[in-house]
Amino acid sequence: IWELKKDVYVVELDWYPDAPGEMVVLTCDTPEEDGITWTLDQSSEVLGSGKTLTIQVKEFGDAGQYTCHKGGEVLSHSLLLLHKKEDGIWSTDILKDQKEPKNKTFLRCEAKNYSGRFTCWWLTTISTDLTFSVKSSRGSSDPQGVTCGAATLSAERVRGDNKEYEYSVECQEDSACPAAEESLPIEVMVDAVHKLKYENYTSSFFIRDIIKPDPPKNLQLKPLKNSRQVEVSWEYPDTWSTPHSYFSLTFCVQVQGKSKREKKDRVFTDKTSATVICRKNASISVRAQDRYYSSSWSEWASVPCS
Amino acid sequence: VPGGSSPAWTQCQQLSQKLCTLAWSAHPLVGHMDLREEGDEETTNDVPHIQCGDGCDPQGLRDNSQFCLQRIHQGLIFYEKLLGSDIFTGEPSLLPDSPVGQLHASLLGLSQLLQPEGHHWETQQIPSLSPSQPWQRLLLRFKILRSLQAFVAVAARVFAHGAATLSP
């Protein structure tokens, strides 16, 4: 058993048929010595008396809010949550496996630049009685500070018969050094509580590996005289790290016909312009990627040819 | 470059960008099979990193690029030694199309651009590499190349910025 926060405790249980469970001793937070009784949740049934209560925690029915009273007055509470371990593996019932980039990916994170700011998100099908708390650091043995906000519900989607809820959190490294080569990864820890079930999820990454620039901005076409060619131009996204002579991007320019089956013409360039042939009803798209480190490409910025 | 003269920023830029490309193309081509039960004990902790105080940020380069260039030079020599060690020359053989050889030669080329014959910087003591067990080598290659990708990315940014803003 360990304390998650004041008056909230997590009991770690090996979950298998006829498991003996964990013996837990609760102590009433009071100077009183006698006349103390214990109840669980809203029940008025007295579970025991005395300053301490010993219980055998085997299942969710044994978890909940234990309260000690004296003469009708509440003295203190202890909320017991369960953390299940089945076949040596902690349960992951609350969050959905996003399976990208690999199986058992519950948390996904992205950064728009090297400033030390990043966003993480996760998915669940649970809509009520759900709380999240997020902590982060750079490194684990001698952790350096990363400050995370509160997790918020950022999207709701219908997937078949199910509703899916996306939560996200923004974090900022306290003393970020954008130009340095990271040697210690960022660690993100999410505590998830659904009713009386506790689970924790972690992710470890370098900012460089989760970089995904915003799409290029101000995408424009300039027709070239007496030609089917156009000059496409664009700018670095506002959110990208500066100076651009140091934090450089590379770009992919694509000409795509109306039909998905039509052949795509692609050009790669380090410049912020390119000359391409504009076909009727086609569109021109541009996306960006760090020039020197192959992290994710941005989403496409697009304009129609006409 | 040792002693304060300027490097050939544009040449360094071109070669460092080539190094980035090679480091990424070498990464999947490091052995005969997938990484599997090799375990994840930390094996590349001792590689030199370009850290916050090394003056490799735009402001530090403007103030005095020598600190940063020396750091990059140390790293290039370090990785050049690693790529020549039995981690890469031993079994499992590199795949026939592996660009590790080109990568190795380019590391040497860039380090020589930064320190021409006859000039000497204090080089960081290269740890003497004890022979590696064949079963460890795939994981070591994987980690070294991942680490090298990060190192050369920073070096390439430095030279790109230098070529754009510090070239005579």
Epitope: - | H32, M33, R36, E37, K81, G84, S85, D86, T89, G90, E91, P92, S93, G101, S128, L129, S130, P131, Q133, P134, W135
Partner: antibody, heavy 115, light 107 residues
Framework: EVQLQQSGPELVKPGASVKMSCKAS????????MHWVKQKPGQGLEWIGY????????KYNEKFKGKATLTSDKSSSTAYMELSSLTSEDSAVYYC????????WGQGTLVTVSA | DIVMTQSPATLSVTPGNRVSLSCRAS??????LHWYQQKSHESPRLLIK???QSISGIPSRFSGSGSGSNFTLSINSVEPEDVGVYYC?????????FGSGTKLEIK
């Protein structure tokens, strides 16, 4: 074409030393480790050790430490093995091998230790 | 040291028959196991690398299988020129060790 050309047979007296060579051609010498293997007449194979010609790092089978010394010369793309304090137990064919998984063995050097 | 045990010590086969040679390692060596053929007065020749990977120039009748500590070299239709001693080798960890060999004879 990759070739490993070993030096010729040696007849040596007990207590003496012998140094044999293995000249590599058809590839860049510094890109592969070179193993040495011993085979006594009518018997099996025993690994002696290897050298990485790029940095001259060596690894020996404990059994051959103090007996065998591996060296290399980049300029001539040649690997060497010196055997010291020879006894009749050292009479064998010695092979140089470029990496186990690359199918290149020298033709062997026969060493005969006899008074 | 990892001990490599080969069986049988000698095998006498009729041309055209399929034959299997066994090699056991005293501890797991994953798939870091190589097979060699040595004919009289010749250098050993690599037949199979990493337990099951074929070598260019080696006839397709030679194949390898196994992982961990049990390995097999199969010759699916023995030819008279296959006579010789077959060695397996631990390529996993130091010191590299060889089996004592299986001698293949033709009836």
């Amino acid at each position: 074409e990759v070739q490993l050309q070993q030096s010729g047979p040696e007849l040596v007296k007990p207590g003496a030393s012998v140094k044999m060579s293995c000249k590599a051609s058809g590839y860049t010498f510094t890109t592969s480790i070179m193993h040495w293997v011993k085979q006594k007449p009518g018997q099996g194979l025993e690994w002696i050790g290897y050298i990485n010609p790029y940095d001259d790092v060596t690894k020996y089978n404990e059994k051959f430490k103090g007996k065998a010394t591996l060296t290399s010369d980049k300029s001539s793309s040649t690997a060497y093995m010196e055997l010291s304090s020879l006894t009749s137990e050292d009479s064998a064919v010695y092979y140089c091998v470029r990496r186990w998984d690359e199918a290149y063995w020298g033709q062997g050097t026969l060493v005969t230790v006899s008074a | 040291d990892i001990v490599m045990t080969q069986s049988p010590a000698t095998l006498s086969v009729t041309p055209g028959n399929r034959v299997s040679l066994s090699c056991r390692a005293s501890q797991s060596i994953s798939d870091y196991l190589h097979w060699y053929q040595q004919k009289s007065h010749e250098s050993p020749r690599l037949l199979i690398k990493y337990a099951s990977q074929s070598i260019s120039g080696i006839p397709s009748r030679f194949s390898g299988s196994g992982s961990g500590s049990n390995f097999t070299l199969s010759i699916n239709s023995v030819e008279p020129e296959d006579v010789g001693v077959y060695y397996c080798q631990n390529g996993h960890s130091f010191p590299f060790t060889f089996g004592s060999g299986t001698k293949l004879e033709i009836k």
